[in-house]
């Protein structure tokens, strides 16, 4: 259930963060794993805050586990990770709020998909089951997602562990769909986040210590008007060596039409390390940090092979 408010969407998908409070090393590692999970499947980027005005702070507040939905703007905002919510899936869920998602079961169209069993709800917790106002939510054409990491479980805020508060109204593949998983982003979560942040249709986030990637359809040529972004992210403290082993793109002055661009960081405003076209292989590129951004654009219908690149963490 994505926010409909553009001001709540983080510009360029970049979310600066600070880990505050008294969190242990293992808790901090969980926070980083959860952020990397979001980065792996979407074009959202979590960057350690330097001087940005708007940023999130991992902290611990009276609400226990809670977060503002989307970007609040005008200063720091808390993502509270209290006792018993420092688990990977729960942090991924809370980061879902930061990214701009309300709970799935609060979608305005939820009554077509689930029943709320009001008599089983803990007294005083009924507000957790209210629907969002239609003008606050834009699900971007995505269907109701029982598998969403943003969905409550069947007995959330129940008066008894065996009493359901949310019941799916129909079967999916012959069974009542399970709800409330806190394992990983669902396909629907990923699809909706990619739409919310207008992620390029091609490219991916590469997080292994070695890997390779290529332009679409390589070596059989690429089509016009392609836009792909690959983000390479290795273990902090390591650097990346990037090698283009094949390059065959339409050659133009300043690589104006078709090009592959490498930036020393994790987003489109990071320092430019090179823009390449034609067939001359560039020298290997070594990052200054643990992240590189590679963007491919084509405008012509000229058919070259494209490119192939390999990288390695050093």
């Amino acid at each position: 259930a994505a926010t409909s408010r553009p001001e709540r969407v983080w510009p360029d998908g970049v979310i600066p963060f600070v880990i505050g409070g008294n969190f242990t090393g293992s808790q901090r590692a969980v926070f980083r794993q959860a952020m990397r999970h979001w980065e792996k499947h979407t074009c959202v980027t979590f960057l350690e805050r330097t001087d940005e005005d708007s940023y999130i702070v991992f902290t611990y507040r009276p609400c226990g586990c809670c977060s503002y939905v989307g970007r609040r703007g005008g200063g720091p905002q808390a993502i509270s990770i209290g006792k018993n919510c420092d688990k990977f899936g729960i942090v991924v869920h809370e980061l879902g709020h930061v990214v701009g998602f309300w709970h799935e079961h609060t979608r305005p169209d939820r009554d077509r998909h689930v029943s709320i069993v009001r008599e089983n709800i803990q007294p005083g917790q009924e507000y957790n089951f209210l629907k969002m106002e239609p003008q606050e939510v834009e699900s971007l054409g995505e269907t109701y997602d029982f598998d969403s990491i943003m969905h409550y479980a069947r007995n959330t805020f129940s008066r008894g562990i065996f009493l359901d508060t949310i019941v799916p109204k129909y079967e999916v593949n012959g069974v009542k769909p399970p709800i409330g998983q806190r394992t990983r982003l669902s396909k629907g979560d990923i699809a909706q986040a990619r739409k919310l942040y207008k992620c390029p249709a091609c490219g991916e986030t590469l997080q292994d210590s070695t890997g390779n990637f290529s332009s679409p359809e390589y070596p059989n040529g690429y089509s016009a008007h392609m836009h792909c972004v690959w983000r390479i992210s290795v273990t902090p403290g390591e650097k990346i060596i990037l090698n283009f082993t094949s390059l065959d793109l339409y050659r133009s002055r300043l690589c104006w039409y078709d090009y592959v661009e490498v930036r020393d960081g994790f987003w489109r405003k990071a320092p430019l390390r090179g823009r390449f076209c034609g067939s001359k292989l560039p020298e290997p590129i070594v990052s200054t940090d643990s992240r590189l951004w590679v963007e491919f654009r084509s405008s012509s219908n000229w058919v070259g092979k494209g490119f192939f690149a390999v990288y390695e963490a050093i």
Partner: antibody
Framework: QVQLVQSGAEVKKPGSSVKVSCKAS????????ISWVRQAPGQGLEWMGA????????EYAQKFQGRVTITADESTSTAYMELSSLRSEDTAVYYC???????????????WGKGTTVTVSS | DIQMTQSPSSVSASVGDRVTITCRAS??????LAWYQQKPGKAPKLLIY???SLQSGVPSRFSGSGSGTDFTLTISSLQPEDFATYYC?????????FGGGTKVEIK
Amino acid sequence: QVQLVQSGAEVKKPGSSVKVSCKASGGTFSEWAISWVRQAPGQGLEWMGAIIPKFGTAEYAQKFQGRVTITADESTSTAYMELSSLRSEDTAVYYCARGAKYYYAEDYMDVWGKGTTVTVSS
Amino acid sequence: DIQMTQSPSSVSASVGDRVTITCRASQGISSWLAWYQQKPGKAPKLLIYAASSLQSGVPSRFSGSGSGTDFTLTISSLQPEDFATYYCQQALSLPYTFGGGTKVEIK
């Protein structure tokens, strides 16, 4: 204008319990964090714990964990702080204070009760 | 827990003086800091929140500054009603912690 009205002074024996109430009037109650802060004679301020009535669960300072219970009754807009196994060092003024609305970043205590004096003496 | 260290513990000053109180956090707390004023037998009163924002109804002679670990409360021209004890409080993370207090006394 929100006001927090606390219950009267208490004198308690060591080993017993005390329950202090804090009633909110003149504004919404359930979405705001209510903190409890104590001040021993001639000493500084010490945060004990907090509750957001709407959430129902309380968070406590480690020092008081197991000895303090903070609850809230939304129907009467009242928060309670119960401290058990009292000892002489618990002699203090106990304040309730309103903090953040739960979904906001700030958590500053802008409205305070007048305080409840609890004396622990045999 | 985040430790808050206030200095000085007391200061003697005259009406009209400029008074500065400092507060240091044991780790970075961004701008999540509050300053309170407390008079004998009374509850604390919020003066400054978010390190530098003046609480509604508080005179403009009070100002706050700082970010990260080091913060300052300044009273530009001390008035008779300002003689009190002042506390800083970090509002970043539970458990919330206060500085030890600074008593502003009449010289």
